[in-house]
């Protein structure tokens, strides 16, 4: 069964700046990735970025830089200033879609005892939906 992993890291240099990394563990061609915060989109979540392998990337504040790391993983850097900046317990969700076969989603947040800049290797987050 395909899985999605989500890793959230607070930058050591800017304590209110976050890096979110997400990846898809499975076969199949990913056609769209959506990153949201505050929960899944439509269930209280807000879209931060949409990444398409051919048509490009769209992102919304406070997202600063979204990019593909590999064909099946992405990263997103969030600005840390202003009213819309994330806090330590913010939930981030990544949805990987392969149209029309299905989509896979997982959410994660900053580990409670994590030191800024210290990150564990990515481990699969609980799958919220694997359709």
């Amino acid at each position: 069964t395909p899985e999605v992993w989500v890793q959230v890291r607070m930058e050591a240099t800017e304590l209110s700046s976050f890096t979110i990394r997400c990846g898809f563990l499975g076969s199949g061609s990913i056609s769209l990735v959506t990153v949201s915060w505050g929960g899944p989109n439509g269930a209280g979540g807000t879209t931060l970025a949409v990444l398409h392998p051919e048509r490009g990337i769209r992102q919304w504040a406070p997202a600063r830089q979204a990019r593909w790391e590999t064909q099946s993983s992405i990263s997103l850097i969030l600005e840390g200033s202003g009213a819309s900046s994330p806090c330590a317990n913010t939930t981030f969700c990544c949805k990987f879609a392969s149209f029309p076969e299905g989509s896979w989603e997982a959410c994660g947040s900053l580990p409670p005892s994590s030191d800024p800049g210290l990150s564990a290797p990515p481990t699969p987050a609980p799958i919220l939906r694997a359709d």
């Epitope: 061609s29 056609s31 769209l32 439509g42 149209f99 029309p100 299905g102 989509s103 989603e105 359709d131």
Partner: antibody, heavy 120, light 106 residues
Framework: EVQLVESGGGLVKPGGSLKLSCAAS????????MSWVRQTPAMRLESVAT????????YYPDTVKGRFTVSRDNAKNTLYLQMSSLRSEDTAIYYC?????????????WGQGTSVTVSS | QIVLTQSPAIMSASPGEKVTMTCSAS?????MFWYQQKPGSSPRLLIY???NLASGVPVRFSGSGSGTSYSLTISRLEAEDAATYYC?????????FGAGTKLDLK
């Protein structure tokens, strides 16, 4: 302006065949997944074929699998639906629709439809 | 395949009223869409991915929901909103539609 124009509908006997076409203009046709969706006399909407990845991957519901074939000619900006072994329950208006991936594959543009009647 | 059940099948409301229709899925869905269809016309996209308004759609339309329960709301009904509204999902193939909610104006 995005336009989708279907053609090829008509009256056909049960067991017969028909080929529908959808001429696309106003966008880069090869970049988009496309579907055929039909609307029955009872006004139900049913997706009958989807084509993605430049025509490599095609998808059909069980109701038409083995009888319908979707294809596309990106050079001609045209989508096709070859229908065979037609049944009375295939009577419907057939629409072609574009899927916009940045809209999460919503069908953001539809043609005007072409009517197919299967009757003896 | 996922079955979408729309309710009510038919509803009637007056201009200015707030109207809500629902779409219930037989299992959890990944992406939900809403379309409007007027007699003699093709369906028109209203809402994509549960709650996002398609281009040119008036802000009186809104969508919400998650999992198996979704809704479309028109905050202040206008005469031009008389139509049939369909929900549609894609989670895995096939893409499926609800049977529609026909909205008439009083």
């Amino acid at each position: 302006e995005v336009q989708l124009v279907e053609s090829g509908g008509g009256l056909v006997k049960p067991g017969g065949s028909l080929k529908l076409s959808c001429a696309a203009s106003g966008f880069t046709f090869s970049n988009f997944a496309m579907s055929w969706v039909r609307q029955t006399p009872a006004m139900r909407l049913e997706s009958v074929a989807t084509i993605v990845n430049g025509g490599i991957n095609t998808y059909y519901p069980d109701t038409v699998k083995g009888r319908f074939t979707v294809s596309r000619d990106n050079a001609k900006n045209t989508l096709y639906l070859q229908m065979s072994s037609l049944r009375s329950e295939d009577t419907a208006i057939y629409y072609c629709a574009r899927h916009d991936d940045f809209l999460y594959y919503a069908m953001d543009y539809w043609g005007q439809g072409t009517s197919v009647t299967v009757s003896s | 395949q996922i079955v979408l059940t729309q309710s009510p099948a038919i509803m009637s409301a007056s201009p200015g009223e707030k109207v809500t229709m629902t779409c219930s899925a037989s299992s959890s869905v990944s992406y939900m869409f809403w379309y409007q269809q007027k007699p003699g016309s093709s369906p028109r996209l209203l809402i994509y991915d549960t709650s996002n308004l398609a281009s040119g759609v008036p802000v009186r339309f809104s969508g919400s929901g998650s999992g198996t329960s979704y809704s479309l709301t028109i905050s202040r009904l206008e005469a031009e909103d008389a139509a049939t509204y369909y929900c549609q999902q894609w989670t895995s193939y096939p893409l499926t539609f609800g049977a529609g909610t026909k909205l008439d104006l009083k």
